[in-house]
């Protein structure tokens, strides 16, 4: 873990101010894989290379984030830089020989729950928010909190509102949200788990 992130940061830090601006504009229109959301324009345009790297990794995870960055660089005519990024990402990431178990690709920060670990990606990518709310209502969410989340206009704003309540939750409350995510958007949990 971290190799792809470092390679993305390296590439973005080597862009001129004008190139970085162009990169961000292209990122707003680049085709995305199904299930991935777009980084909001307002937040994106004000970011420096470091913030943008963090945002790319939290939205798209390391592997796809690096691939997407390379695609945008290629689209900008920066083929050599795109090639270097992909080479750095793939270096040392070959498959384990048959019969040998590769260790998990990453270890989450100890003591950090899955939903805290993947907060940004969950805000961006959870679509079935109403289902989550129904699953959590009465167990984790009060009626007032339930209504406050439902009142938000978009899925990301609903999730952001839901996350505003999580600092008061204990581990088991967070587990109930994770369980609801497993049941409603299992593919997303799998995807984040691989990151």
């Amino acid at each position: 873990m971290g190799r792809a992130r470092d390679a993305i940061l390296d590439a973005l830090e080597n862009l001129t101010a004008e190139e970085l601006k162009k990169f961000k504009l292209k990122l707003l229109s680049v085709p995305l894989r199904e299930g991935y959301g777009r980084i909001p324009r307002g937040a994106l345009l004000s970011m420096d290379a470091l913030d943008l790297t963090d945002k790319l990794v939290s939205f798209y995870l390391e592997t796809y984030g690096a691939e997407l960055t390379a695609n945008v660089l290629r689209d900008m005519g920066l083929q050599e830089m795109a090639g270097q990024l992909q080479a750095a990402t793939h270096q040392g990431s070959g498959a384990a020989p048959a019969g040998i178990q590769a260790p998990p690709q990453s270890a989450a920060k100890p003591g950090l729950h899955f939903i805290d670990q993947h907060r940004a990606a969950l805000i961006a990518r959870v679509t079935n928010v109403e289902w989550l709310l129904d699953a959590l209502y009465g167990k984790v969410l009060t009626d007032e909190q339930y209504q406050a989340v439902r009142a938000e206009p978009t899925n990301p704003s609903k999730m952001r509102k839901l996350f505003s309540f999580t600092p008061a939750w204990n581990w088991t409350c967070k587990d109930l949200l994770l369980q609801a995510l497993r049941e409603s958007q299992s593919y997303l949990v799998e995807d984040l788990e691989r990151s």
Epitope: A108, G111, L112, W171, L178, E193
Partner: antibody
Framework: EVQLVQSGAEVKKPGESLKISCKIS????????IHWMHQMPGKGLEWIGY????????MYNEKFRGQATLSADKSISTAYLQWSSLKASDTAMYFC???????????????WGQGTLVTVSS | DIQMTQSPSTLSASVGDRVTITCHAS??????LSWYQRKPGKAPKLLIY???NLHTGVPSRFSGSGSGTEFTLTISSLQPDDFATYYC?????????FGQGTKLEIK
């Protein structure tokens, strides 16, 4: 090396109280959930619940809620399972276990204690 | 609660045989299933997690597959050390539940 060492076998009478322990070493105790399972003679494994020592919160199988209590002592990296009033049906082998890792896949139990046999008989 | 049903309950086989144990979930559990091996007087040992991932140190003759409600554990060529009881476990939702076990015995 991750190790979970459980307390020894117990023979008790119905109505008595009991607290069995699971001493953890090899990782930071407060970073992971500790789960408890039991196996009654001739039966399959059953999940009792878990405790998260980081904040002391516990999740129970509803079947065991009110029957047994999970706790943890951070100062000595030890998790406990206790009963205030044992029944003959509590006779079983009890295991503590730690998940493979602490985030989404904490449902897979890679590390187990050796088991504590509890016999309740008059 | 999600019920896990294993079949067969007992399986007689010989060293070198290919054996398959199945596990049926009473509702969709996606890929959130693991397999354990248990020998008398010992703690269970994790073999497979998330349906098909081989746990570190487990011989490659063990493999897992399936998603949704139907899962299988396959041992490609039985070794003397493999005679034991095998359990599946779902991790989709609480309470976590195990199958009743499949006892693999020498024919």
């Amino acid at each position: 090396e991750v190790q979970l060492v459980q307390s020894g076998a117990e023979v008790k009478k119905p109505g008595e109280s009991l607290k069995i322990s699971c001493k953890i070493s090899g990782y930071t105790f407060t970073d992971q959930t500790i789960h408890w399972m039991h196996q009654m003679p001739g039966k399959g494994l059953e999940w009792i619940g878990y405790i998260y020592p980081g904040d002391g919160s516990a999740m129970y199988n509803e079947k065991f809620r009110g029957q047994a209590t999970l706790s943890a002592d951070k100062s000595i990296s030890t998790a406990y399972l206790q009963w205030s009033s044992l029944k003959a049906s509590d006779t079983a082998m009890y295991f503590c276990a730690r998940p493979l890792y602490s985030y989404a896949s904490y449902y897979w139990f890679a590390y187990w204690g050796q088991g504590t046999l509890v016999t309740v008989s008059s | 609660d999600i019920q896990m049903t294993q079949s067969p309950s007992t399986l007689s086989a010989s060293v070198g045989d290919r054996v398959t144990i199945t596990c049926h979930a009473s509702q969709n559990i996606n890929v959130w299933l693991s397999w354990y091996q248990r020998k008398p007087g010992k703690a269970p040992k994790l073999l497979i997690y998330k349906s098909s991932n081989l746990h570190t140190g487990v011989p490659s003759r063990f493999s897992g597959s399936g998603s949704g409600t139907e899962f299988t554990l396959t041992i490609s060529s039985l070794q003397p050390d493999d005679f034991a009881t095998y359990y599946c476990q779902q991790g989709q939702s609480y309470p976590l539940t195990f199958g009743q076990g499949t006892k693999l015995e020498i024919k």
